[in-house]
């Protein structure tokens, strides 16, 4: 509408509808069209209600902006009042017939200019033309740069900052190297930059698992070691480890039908609990094989511990001790059965006695006044423990005994229940299975040690302490510590070890003081069916090898220095270890692998019995040695 027409319409409106009241038809005459009339008239009625007769209604609230009826009515035809456009985004508002048109500022869109245009997502101007970061803002956008870059004058492109030139001392003692958007402080190999101190510090490669097993760090580098205790040696790449190889295969076949009694160094190998109708008197039948001379075969007791029966071996013969409310007895008898052969043993409670048979021949008959174990309401409850005691029972025994027994049981029948109970337990547990064939001797499997406390001081000897050692060995692996003395400060003042020789299929015997080799007996073929014998004497002045073998030794002067170290240690406390080393630093000795094979040790005239050790790894067999693997045609 042109302005002339608008003014006429305004005058008509004033006359028809403000000075007087108009109806809808009269209003139409003013506007001369329906859309504007339909838009105007309801709003006109609202103005009337608000200002007529001074009424204040709810409708009034929508006309609060107008002081009087005139201004309220005059504003109705103007579609741009009140402003329908978004104030932030509009440039102008144009009134139309019952409509309006908002003209938007750049960067805005929509009927009311209410939507911001995201210039950063404009497909025709990728990333808003910014080279790095585009930030959209209401009605606009701007470009920015990543850290380490500066904006060029075109406000769109970024340029890398050369931090090294800007601040020459940026890296301290390290070398500064500029990189896009950043800089690096470079250090020599084996060193790492420390931000706080602005200097290069040694990298602890050991903490980064560079080595397969053991690692020692030093400035600018590191050295890998392999854990000999786990049977490894360093490979050619100087990082990974390879297994120490077997030089004499042993027959380690086991059978679950054979129960190994020495599975635990201290403690019971198997525990069974019976509750049976009282017609079941105590009975135990089994085949038994051992080279051991003393130990517990089985210990049975009533539920309340008041009655007990011990079947043991002492001096290679069967011993029975029993105690209940009626009696207390001990009997040893029969032939020596620690001969490594299978012997059939039976212990049966009869009405008035306990009968012990070996190979079905009665060897003992022990009288008893009443039942061994008292039934409870017709049921006999008994606990049976193999190869040990359930708790400290030494004080209860008639005669104390070392319970440790290296032996095997098969074809058992307990309480007339056959193999029930035992078979189920041992079938699943490999370490309860016995070797099929064994020989006399002690076996070190390459996984543990035995500890003894031996007094090497000889009061009558002017020399003070002395060590006389005899070793009978049949190694199965060519590397390992056979005997070691360890002092309380975790040093190893004396060790006798085996190492694979540089010459093929032979071994060296190494005698060391701490980490220095003082004697090397070279190139012996020790991995054979035959046992090898080694005998030597050591005191503070001398080390004397009594076995005629070719040796390589250090100078006399150096030897005296090393013997002085040994002498100092021997004046303190030392523990004797067989078969390997306890937890000492792996750099403490030239060899740290466990010994694998058979070995008997005599120290100062005493044959060491592993059952008497202070501690012993469960897998070391005190009185049985696996046979050498015999190659069959098929194998």
């Amino acid at each position: 509408a042109n302005s002339m027409l608008e003014e006429t319409k305004q005058g008509n409106l004033e006359r028809e509808c403000i000075e007087e009241l108009c109806n809808k038809e009269e209003a139409r005459e003013v506007f001369e069209n329906d859309p504007e009339t339909d838009y105007f008239y309801p709003k006109y009625l609202v103005c009337l209600r608000s200002f007529q007769s001074g009424l204040f209604t709810a409708a009034r609230q929508s006309t609060d902006a107008y002081p009087d009826l005139r201004s309220c009515v005059n504003a109705i035809p103007d579609q741009c009042s009140p402003l329908p456009c978004n104030e932030d985004g509009y440039m102008s508002c144009k009134d139309g017939k019952a409509s309006f048109t908002c003209t938007c500022k750049p960067g805005w869109q929509g009927e009311k200019c209410e939507f911001d245009i995201n210039e950063c997502k404009d497909p025709s101007n990728i990333n808003g033309g910014c080279s790095q970061i585009c930030d959209n803002t209401p009605g606009s956008y701007h470009c920015s740069c990543k850290s380490g870059f500066v904006m060029l004058s075109n406000k769109k492109d970024c340029k890398d900052v050369d931090e090294c030139s800007l601040k020459p001392n940026m890296c301290g003692t390290a070398v500064c190297k500029n990189i896009p958007g950043d800089f690096e402080c470079e250090c020599p190999e084996g060193y790492r930059y420390n931000l706080k101190s602005k200097s290069c510090e040694d990298v602890d490669e050991c903490s980064e698992n560079m080595c397969a097993q053991l690692c020692v760090n030093y400035p600018g580098g590191y050295t890998c070691y392999c854990d000999g205790k786990k049977g490894f040696k360093l490979a050619q790449d100087q990082k990974s480890c390879e297994a120490v190889s077997v030089c004499l295969p042993l027959n380690l076949d086991t059978k679950y039908e054979l129960l190994y009694l020495a599975e635990q160094f201290a403690g019971v190998v198997l525990y069974l609990k019976f509750r049976l109708p009282e017609i079941s008197r105590f009975s135990a039948e089994f085949d038994f094989r051992t080279y051991d001379s003393q130990g517990v075969i089985l210990y049975a007791e009533s539920i309340d511990h008041s009655a007990w029966l011990l079947i043991a071996l002492r001096g290679g013969k069967i011993e029975v001790q029993l105690k209940n409310e009626h009696t207390s007895k001990i009997t040893t008898g029969g032939d020596i059965i620690n001969n490594g052969l299978w012997n059939m043993v039976s212990v049966e409670e009869l009405e008035h006695s306990i009968s012990i048979k070996i190979a079905k021949e009665a060897v003992m008959d022990i009288n008893k006044p009443g039942p061994l174990f008292k039934p409870e309401n017709g049921l006999l409850e008994t606990k049976v423990y193999f190869a040990g005691f359930p708790r400290k029972v030494e004080s209860e025994l008639i005669k104390p005994i070392n319970p440790r027994l290296d032996g095997c049981i098969r074809s058992w029948n307990l309480m007339k229940q056959g193999a029930s109970g035992i078979k189920e337990i041992i079938q699943e547990k490999q370490n309860k299975h016995c070797l099929v064939t064994v020989e006399k001797g002690s076996y070190y499997p390459g996984s543990g040690i035995a500890e003894f406390h031996i007094d090497y001081n000889n009061g009558s000897n002017a020399e003070g302490w002395h060590i006389n050692v005899t070793l009978n060995i049949r190694p199965s692996m060519g590397t390992g510590v056979m005997l070691a003395l360890v002092s309380s400060n975790n040093t190893v003042p004396f060790a006798v070890s085996l190492v694979d020789s540089t010459s093929e299929k032979s071994q060296d015997i190494v005698i060391s003081v701490e980490n220095t080799v003082i004697y090397r007996i070279q190139a012996l073929s020790l991995c054979s069916n035959q046992r090898s014998h080694l005998e030597f004497r050591v005191n503070r002045n001398n080390l004397e090898l009594l076995t005629p073998l070719k040796i390589e030794t250090i100078s006399q002067e150096e030897l005296q220095t090393q013997l002085a170290i040994l002498d100092k240690a021997m004046k303190g406390k030392v523990a004797t270890y067989l078969g390997g080393l306890p937890d000492v630093p792996f750099s403490a000795t030239p060899v740290n692998a466990f010994y694998n094979g058979c070995m008997e040790v005599n120290i100062n005239g005493v044959e060491l019995d592993l059952d008497e050790a202070i501690s012993k790894h469960n897998d070391i067999r005190a009185h049985s040695c696996p046979s050498v693997w015999k190659k069959t045609k098929n194998s």
Epitope: F274, R275, I279, L379, K416, Q417, S420
Partner: antibody, heavy 121, light 109 residues
């Protein structure tokens, strides 16, 4: 898992004998005592005796002494209960029940599904 | 011969705790009676629940427990469930034989 499967229903004349079987699976047959229990129609349970499958030892309730024989065949893990000189009041469902712990008598943990024996002329 | 007596019937609600008892005509029930509790479900389906007074049989839910209460053996169901509706028999050992109770019909409403 442990299962005790009994033989099917039997109809017998008074004076005859019946032999009920109980096949065991899922465990070592010889390690567990086997009990026999019966339940007459509308009555409670009545314990008859036990057998040690390993040794073959048996013990019968006094009421059944002389009329009941319990046996086993370890090769097929099966226990049997034979009752002779049947009377009409022997009509009942007969159950085998196995101890729940090895070598531990007197815990009736597992039961067969029962065998109905009807004694009728 | 000894007589073993049980409640003939008991009613409980889901989630409630209910105790069934077992009395011996010979005197107090002791641990030496090795009390057993057996559950009978429809179709003559028997399951051992408790042996030796308080040993739960393998696979039996922990809500079932056995004990001695006074001079009786007891089976307690802590937080009964609708599937526990059944007949419960106790059995007591007397030197050389078991004697069963008449059973308790437990209803879980």
């Amino acid at each position: 898992q442990v299962q005790l499967v009994q033989s099917g229903a039997e109809v017998k004349k008074p004076g005859a004998s019946v032999k009920v079987s109980c096949k065991s699976s899922g465990h070592t047959f010889t390690g567990y005592y086997m009990h026999w229990v019966r339940q007459a129609p509308g009555q409670g349970l009545e314990w008859m005796g036990w057998i040690n499958p390993n040794s073959g030892d048996t013990n019968y309730a006094q009421k059944f002494q002389g009329r009941v024989t319990m046996t086993r065949d370890t090769s097929i893990s099966t226990a049997y209960m034979e009752m002779s000189r049947l009377r009409s009041d022997d009509t009942a469902v007969y159950y085998c029940a196995r101890d729940s712990q090895i070598l531990w008598f007197g815990e009736l943990g597992y039961w067969g599904q029962g065998t109905l024996v009807t004694v009728s002329s | 011969q000894a007589v073993v007596t049980q409640e003939s019937a008991l009613t409980t609600s889901p989630g409630e705790t209910v105790t069934l008892t077992c009395r011996s005509s010979t005197g107090a029930v002791t641990a030496s009676n090795y009390a057993n509790w057996v559950q009978e479900k429809p179709d003559h389906l028997f399951t051992g629940l408790i042996g030796s007074t308080n040993n739960r049989a393998p696979g039996v839910p922990a809500r079932f427990s056995g004990s001695l209460i006074g001079d009786k053996a007891a089976l307690t169901i802590t937080g009964a469930q609708t599937e526990d509706e059944a007949i419960y028999f106790c059995a007591l050992w007397y030197s050389d034989h078991f004697v069963f109770g008449g059973g308790t019909k437990l209803t879980v409403l």
